[in-house]
Structures are given as C-alpha cells and as structure tokens.
Amino acid sequence: KEEKTTFRDCAEIFKSGLTTSGIYTLTFPNSTEEVKAYCDMDMGGGGWTVIQHREDGSVDFQRTWKEYKEGFGSPLGEYWLGNEFVSQLTSGHRYVLKIQLKDWEGSEAHSLYEHFYLSGEESNYRIHLTGLTGTAGKISSISQPGSDFSTKDSDNDKCICKCSQMLTGGWWFDACGPSNLNGQYYPQKQNTNKFNGIKWYYWKGSGYSLKATTMMIRPADF
C-alpha cells in the first residue's frame, strides 16, 4: 500500500504525526495543485490551518480579486491563503473557524464559529457562518447572513459606495459592516478613530484598529 504523502489541511498533517507548527504544503481537494500554509499545531489541540494573519503591516492587503483568489503574502508572516483553496476545502467537509485577535493594550480575544464555509467563485466566495461562541463579542462582527467577498476591482457589497475601496482590503463587506480584518494596518497610538483600519466592532468598537489577527480553520470532527 502506497503511503499517503499529500494533505488537504493541517489537521491531516497533525494526525500523521507532524505536530510542529510551521509551513506545510497542502493539496487542493481532488487535484494536484498545491498551496503553502501555516499550520498552528499548538493552539487549542493543534491542527489549525491558518487562512489569514496580520501582525505588523508588512504586507499590502489592498489586492485584486485574483490575488485574494489565489493567495498572497508569506505564511511565516502576514498572508491570505486564498479564497479558491478555502472554498474547495470547506465545501467538502464541515469546518470550524477560529478568529484570534490582539489589541494594543495587551488583551486577546477570539470568536469561534462552529460551521464555516465559502461558496464558490460563481457566488463571489460568499461566507457562511453559524454557531458563534467566544470572547470577542456575543454578536457576530461578520455580518449575518453572510456577504459576498469584495475587492478593490470587484464590488459585491450592499453599499451605495464601494466598501473595498473606501475601507481598503478584500472582505465580506455588507454596507460596509462591523468588521474588516484586511484593512489598513495602523501602529500603536495611531490606531483609533480610523475609517479603514483592522476592525472587529463587537470586541473593540468602531474605529479601533487591531494589533494582530489570525483566522484559522479545522475540521469540526477533529
């Protein structure tokens, strides 16, 4: 029997015995196409596939639809894994989404959604979320029901404006909504009263731009 050498997510890697956090190669479902991802093998039991990370403003998140589709940045630092991969991954299996947040005052919080998936590109990678728990707000800062994804060159929001151009970054904008984790990065002491910052309203309120964010997914049956 041939040994399995491809992994669809970090949970499979963890279960294979590779339990050190770091960059791993994942393979698209039913394909040979590959993507590099950061696997968090320490947080809450391990096996987390990181799909987004912000920490220092070193990567420009005001990107095109194609770039958000395919992914950009470095898995060792700030990056976006890619909407197409996440859509394919989450459409074939039930995943949970954990969003880890840090503010500039040394506090941390998280939001955990018990079911997360993205529709395909034909539905603009619409986000679907249910079952919110966690410490980053009792109400979802990602608008419910889920919105289509928008970028600076693909406006799919419900606003008379173009949210992605106004707030910067690609996101599941409503009109424009209570969150944008892909907004402009602002340093400490310059991070309040911002119209286009890294926002998670139901934890830190309006205009507060966060220090660090991580979005990660894991199979619900892990």
Epitope: C159, I160, M166, A175, C176, N193, F195, K199, S206
Partner: nanobody, 129 residues
C-alpha cells in the same frame, strides 16, 4: 488625524434647554455624516440625531423628535444639537461621531452605529431639579 470634540453639556432643570457643539477636525463635513449618540449609566449607547451636511438630510430618534434640533456650520466644521424641553430621562453622556456619507446600504437613509468610526470623548448632560 480625525478629531471630534463635544462641549456644552451641564446640569439643567427639567423643561430647560442646552446646546451641544461638536467641533470636527481632520475631515470636511461635506463628505461625512455626523451623528449624536447618548449613553446613560448601565444602558447601551443609542442614536439621538444625525445630519448629512451635503444634502441637508437629518434624522431624529422618536424619543427626541420635536424637542431636539440638529444643525451644522460647515464654515466652522461644527455640528450642533439644540436640546429643548429636557427630561430626566435625557440624562446621559452625549457623543458625536462621524461616518463617510457614502457608507449607506441601498434603500436606507441612515447608518448603523458600527459604521461610525470616529468618536469624541463625550459631554455629560444631567437633567435634574
């Protein structure tokens, strides 16, 4: 940087009047809507009134209609809230906040509180005899 500074709060008897001011810097009122919000002890922050200077549109919460009047002076980059016939239940910290005027949902006239990204520090209004 965007700054909003409220002033004009104080102690007033029931039935009295106050005029609050919101001095705005770092943005021009033509491109933004300015809202007044209030928060009483132990209660959620709630919208009171708002104005879009560019179109002259105004909004009032039902609880203040006919008693409060919002206005703006674009030359001074200042928004005012004239509060008449004040009641004890109007006691709260009053905040002004700004939102880009275009950040509107199709078919809607006004903005949810989470769209206001720039806030002042607030001014206390106490209505008591």
């Amino acid at each position: 940087d965007v700054q909003l500074v409220e002033s004009g709060g104080g102690l007033v008897q029931p039935g009295g009047s106050l005029r609050l001011s919101c001095a705005v810097s770092g943005i021009t009122l033509d491109d933004y809507a300015i809202g007044w919000f209030r928060q009483a002890p132990g209660k959620e922050r709630e919208g009171v009134s708002a104005i879009r200077s560019s179109g002259g549109s105004t909004y009032y919460a039902d609880s203040v209609k006919g008693r409060f009047t919002i206005s703006s002076d674009n030359s001074k980059n200042t928004v005012y809230l004239q509060m008449n016939s004040l009641r004890p239940e109007d006691t709260a910290v009053y905040y002004c906040a700004a939102v880009p005027a275009g950040r509107l949902r199709y078919g809607e006239q006004w903005y949810p509180i989470y769209e206001y990204d720039a806030w002042g520090q607030g001014t206390l209004v106490t209505v008591s005899s």
